[in-house]
């Protein structure tokens, strides 16, 4: 239930996060599961624990194994497992499947390739990017923050992309590389000003107090893969994440491609345990892309339960 796979290359830095959640103030203890030996916290060690993070600086093939992390809350010890595998560096250019992160796909209008796991590291821009082991050069390639943007993507751009960056720990530098495949979807598409299919403008949605309710924001943006298209919900003009109501969450639906070929997106707003005060809020379905933003407003009203008379 709380286990996670992590991998890296020998002589590179590898940082692994404990799969169990805990507050930053909680103590986290790490152990090497096979020997039950405690991982030290002193940074002078090559392998050391730092709160929720386990750091291999640098990693060695012998470090492979299962590591146990125990998050010590005041009430319970919450246990997680990190299955770590460190591989020898390949002499040739090929990156084996077991070192690959998830494949991403792009098109002419959307060609972002994110560098996997980089958020765990203390790195500074710019990233170096390689395709099939060749350093990327030319104005078509732009390293931006933690991702690579390719302009005017062509089918020939498909391949394995490796990001390389330096992790800094107390003044010492360690190299990190991560590779993922990029596939190109060959689509002749176009984009339009967003069209919201649901909800209707100023729609009144009936809900029952105490029950769960779902609102779906659905919009279409044109044909083919869209660059910079999004649907989202706002509450009283505020982003859901900023509104601070744990009962109300948004959840991405499926990318939809209707029979007419239009590219559409869904965003479902889930309201758990509907309360009276939810009826006072204004719910805005927003659809935006490079052409602009369209907004449809929904309000909730109380559904009166049907009386059953004998």
């Amino acid at each position: 239930k709380f286990s996670k796979q992590s991998w890296g290359l020998e002589n590179e830095a590898l940082i692994v996060r404990c799969p169990r959640q805990g507050k930053p103030s909680y103590t986290v203890d790490w152990y090497y599961s096979q020997t039950n030996k405690s991982i030290p916290t002193q940074e002078r060690n090559r392998v050391f624990a730092s709160g929720q993070l386990l750091k291999f600086l640098p990693a060695a093939v012998a470090d492979s194994g299962i590591y146990t992390c125990i998050v010590r809350s005041p009430t319970f010890n919450r246990t997680g497992y990190a299955n770590v595998t460190i591989y020898k560096k390949q002499s040739d250019c090929n990156v084996p499947d077991y070192l690959m992160y998830s494949t991403v796909s792009g098109s002419e209008k959307n060609s972002k390739i994110y560098c996997p796991t980089i958020d765990l590291y203390n790195w500074t821009a710019p990233l170096e990017w390689f395709k099939n082991c060749q350093a990327l050069q030319g104005s078509r390639y732009r390293a931006h923050k933690s991702f690579l943007v390719i302009d005017n993507v062509m089918t020939e751009d498909a391949g394995d992309y490796t990001c390389k960056f330096i992790h800094n720990e107390n003044g010492a530098n360690y190299s990190v590389t991560a590779t993922r495949s990029f596939t190109v979807k060959d689509e002749q598409g176009f984009s339009l000003f967003p069209v919201i299919g649901a909800p209707a403008q100023n729609e009144i949605k009936e809900v029952e107090i105490g029950k769960n309710a779902n609102l779906t924001c659905s919009a279409c943006f044109g044909k083919g893969t869209q660059f910079l298209a999004a649907v989202l919900w706002q509450l009283n003009g505020t982003k859901i994440t900023d509104f601070g109501e744990p009962r109300i969450q948004q959840e991405e639906g499926q990318n939809q491609s209707f029979s007419n070929g239009l590219a559409c997106l869904d965003m479902v707003l889930r309201i758990a345990d509907v309360k009276e005060e939810d009826l006072l809020l204004q719910y805005d379905c927003l659809a935006l892309n490079l052409h602009g933003l369209r907004r449809h407003t929904v309000r909730l009203s109380r559904k009166n339960p049907i009386d059953h008379h004998s």
């Epitope: 507050k23 930053p24 103030s25 809350s73 005041p74 319970f76 010890n77």
Partner: antibody
């Protein structure tokens, strides 16, 4: 929606034992810790202890060790607290409470069980 | 055990007034939670992790603090705010509550 249904009021004799129950619904019982709290006019709110229904692990306030025993039945999504060797100072309102697993605070409280210990 | 001392024990305020109640811990805690209880009802989560409002809590409430000193503030008191407010720490076992501040409206 999340509900914690506690058993009804109890009137018991000193020296006896009693088991209070708390039936959970509206969420996955094993995903959240269940805690118990005692409330009296004199001492206010006191944390008794907690159980992790997934593992059966328990944590107690030292003050209530030997007094309270916490258990959970996964099949019925019910948490139990047994109170033993009852005395008048055990007379109180008792709450079972679910804990928010992200922020570690008491997010859903049962409606309470009133326990009266009297001869 | 970490002892939480709430002050004042009773707070009397007029509607529209700004009020602040405090909770002092006998040793440093990382976060403070607050609960509201009205007579005959179970306590309700009110503020968690020092400053986050729980579900359905009006925006006139706010929480702040760090270390050993925490507070709950109501910018403009309303009649429905009359209740007892308890602070609670989750930094060490046993978890402990304050004795409460009872907010009365004039």
């Amino acid at each position: 929606q999340v509900q914690l249904q506690q058993s009804g009021a109890e009137l018991v004799r000193p020296g006896a034992s009693v088991t209070l129950s708390c039936k959970a619904s509206g969420y996955t019982f094993t995903d959240y810790e269940m805690h118990w709290v005692k409330q009296t006019p004199v001492l206010g709110l006191e944390w008794i202890g907690a159980i992790d229904p997934e593992t059966g692990d328990t944590a107690y306030n030292q003050k209530f060790k030997g007094k309270a025993t916490l258990t959970a039945d996964k099949s019925s999504s019910t948490a139990y607290m047994e109170l033993s060797s009852l005395a008048s100072e055990d007379s109180a309102v008792y709450y079972c409470i679910r804990v928010d697993s992200n922020y570690d605070y008491f997010d859903y409280w049962g409606q309470d069980t009133t326990l009266t210990v009297s001869s | 055990d970490i002892v939480l001392t709430q002050s004042p024990p009773i707070l009397s305020a007029s509607p529209g007034e700004k009020v602040t109640m405090t909770c002092r811990a006998s040793s440093s805690v990382s976060y403070m939670h607050w609960y509201q209880q009205k007579p005959g009802s179970s306590p309700k989560p009110w503020i968690y992790d020092t400053s986050n409002l729980a579900s359905g809590v009006p925006a006139r409430f706010s929480g702040s603090g760090s270390g050993t000193s925490y507070s709950l503030t109501i910018s403009r008191v309303e009649a429905e705010d009359a209740a007892t407010y308890y602070c609670q720490q989750w930094s060490s076992n046993p978890l402990t509550f304050g004795a409460g501040t009872k907010l009365e409206l004039k």
